[in-house]
Amino acid sequence: KKEDGESTAPTPRPKVLRCKCHHHCPEDSVNNICSTDGYCFTMIEEDDSGLPVVTSGCLGLEGSDFQCRDTPIPHQRRSIECCTERNECNKDLHPTLPPLKNRDFVDGPIHHR
């Protein structure tokens, strides 16, 4: 998994990387495999009814550094992990949803500093 503080631009790969894809496959993908010049990813997020949905696929090199950083988004529970070490490496990624915070399901008082 890429570290949150990592800020170096991703280095171009010399060769294509194949990833497993699920809910995120290009139209022409064969056997649920996609190809990329960047990263494989697996992501877990809550759908509108609060159920966890796992998505996996390919991220292009362009912009993937930001996408793989897994910056927390307010009021959205999701987690993403990225890898490049071998083909279909994202089969072995198992991101977990961040824990619920009280304010996610109770509208408590608003505190101002």
């Epitope: 010399p14 060769k15 294509v16 022409d28 996609c34 010049d37 390919c58 292009g60 071998r86 083909n87």
Partner: antibody, heavy 116, light 112 residues
Amino acid sequence: QVQLQQPGAEVVRPGASLKLSCKASGYTFTSYWMQWIKQRPGQGLEWIGEIDPSDNYTMYNQKFKGKATLTVDTSSSTAYMQLSSLTSEDSAVYFCARFGFYVDYWGQGTTLTVSS
Amino acid sequence: DVVMTQTPLSLPVSLGDQASISCRSSQSLVHSTGNTYLHWYLQKPGQSPNLLIYKVSNRFSGVPDRFSGSGSGTDFTLKISRVEAEDLGVYFCSQSTHVPFTFGSGTKLEIK
């Protein structure tokens, strides 16, 4: 410089199997895929499949599944393609080729003749 | 499979002339990464193909600047500005966007 060495010619009987070799030099073998391509006169070029020597991951053209099996020996930087149940339709020139996002270097090709 | 249609099949030229070869694909070659993996090769008699142009318009190392590639989506062109004797042979376009990778049927460049 990048070199992919293949035997010049092979002659085999129908029904036999054959393992073609491709010895790579001049680059880090595991840093690129190795592809195999078939060329028959008047039939153009056909992509058979590819193997990533870093993890032995293979992808095949559906048309050649069951006909071709790709392997590598990283200790000798050699790629292999086993062809089974050979018929006259398999008589062709077979190229190995280095692939990153496109083929940039080709072997000289092995001419396979299947004949009784 | 993506069908690559090359025209013309044969291209007779005089040395010093400009030559133009067309390659059309049956579907877009724009990859999900934004790259277009369309390439051009020259195969001389009795030899293996040599890479000329990769990703539509990038000349491979050592390829003279009289070779240029252009196009987008499904429509691509290889141009040779001034044909020299060493340019004669069969030109192939190839795509590595979609599996299985496919090739054009070839254009034979020959002397008029």
